[in-house]
Amino acid sequence: EEELQIIQPDKSVSVAAGESAILHCTITSLFPVGPIQWFRGAGPARVLIYNQRQGPFPRVTTVSETTKRENMDFSISISNITPADAGTYYCIKFRKGSPDTEFKSGAGTELSVRAKPS
């Protein structure tokens, strides 16, 4: 079976305050079994942005139908961006278990927030 890669294509994304940000993430293999989660930041202080198995996450929607069995696109859209949303976002694959354990992370996408156009 193919080795899992997590493709976060964009190193950085810039969005105006009030707009939506699309953060791209694609995986290359369905194995190992387990959910995808998105975090802002790294380490112990990281903030959970989206979990495929939990919710709701009111400002976050998935770009494609993540409940499809063979879906490999886990890109998300975050609505009504504010300066507090700035940071580096990581798409992370977890291996199913009790509890789920982190398996592999994408390279990260830095979100910067521009002032709202007047």
């Epitope: 493709i7 294509p9 964009d10 190193k11 694609t26 290359t28 994408g106 390279a107 990260g108």
Partner: antibody, heavy 119, light 103 residues
């Protein structure tokens, strides 16, 4: 074997239109994003446009936005590029490329079709 | 934009590295074109993946903002133009190309 065969190129005058086609075989066409890439004489490769697997999302280079339209017919395993308001700087070989799982990576290419815009 | 050298040379049987840097991409690919107007061939996609029809002497690696195509045991038929490609559309996807001359 994956095969991509482009057609529809030719010589047109500035301002005229042309429609390119790409017939795909050897893979499940409906599952993959598809892309047009062009190469002007003596120049490098230039991304033109990409369309999603279902055909509901399209992406364009700034140089062709508003003039070119990408489309596909999954029932016919075919990709299209409608080119309007053609300019001399659109002269190039146009390649059809199959996108890998992330759509800006290409794993197979066609042989290309030449478009010449000249008065 | 993606930046790569305009030209490099290598001895027959030797090893050559072609680098590409810059842009807004986390991941890269490499494409070979043997003559102007001929169909490009994908050598590497998503940093390190090699299509099954590509010889193992071609390999790719990425570190930070720089990706490298390495050809080990250069053959005469490797003389070509090599384009790097980025994963982010903001890059325009392709570098300007590097011409490899085999000595």
């Amino acid at each position: 074997d994956v095969q991509l065969v482009e057609s529809g190129g030719g010589v047109v005058r500035p301002g005229e239109s042309l429609r390119l086609s790409c017939e795909a075989s050897g893979f499940t066409f409906r599952n993959y994003y598809m892309t047009w890439v062009r190469q002007a004489p003596g120049e490098g490769l230039e991304w033109v446009s990409t369309i999603s697997d279902t055909g509901d999302t399209a992406y364009y280079a700034d140089s062709v936005k508003g003039r070119f339209t990408i489309s596909r017919d999954n029932s016919k395993n075919s990709l299209y590029l409608q080119m309007n308001s053609l300019r001399a700087d659109d002269t190039a070989i146009y390649y059809c490329a199959k996108s890998w799982i992330w759509w800006t990576f290409f794993d197979y290419w066609g042989l290309g079709t030449l478009v010449t815009v000249s008065s | 934009a993606l930046t790569q050298p305009a030209s490099v040379s290598a001895n027959l049987g030797g090893t050559v590295e072609i680098t590409c840097s810059g842009g807004n991409s986390n991941h890269y690919g490499w494409y070979q074109q043997k003559s102007p107007g001929s169909a490009p061939v994908t050598l590497i996609y998503a940093d390190t993946n090699r299509p099954s029809n590509i010889p193992s002497r071609f390999s790719g690696s990425t570190s930070g903002s720089t990706t490298t195509l390495t050809i080990t045991g250069v053959q005469a038929e490797d003389e070509a133009v090599y384009y790097c490609g980025g994963s982010s559309t903001g890059d325009g996807i392709f570098g300007a190309g590097t011409t490899l001359t085999v000595l």
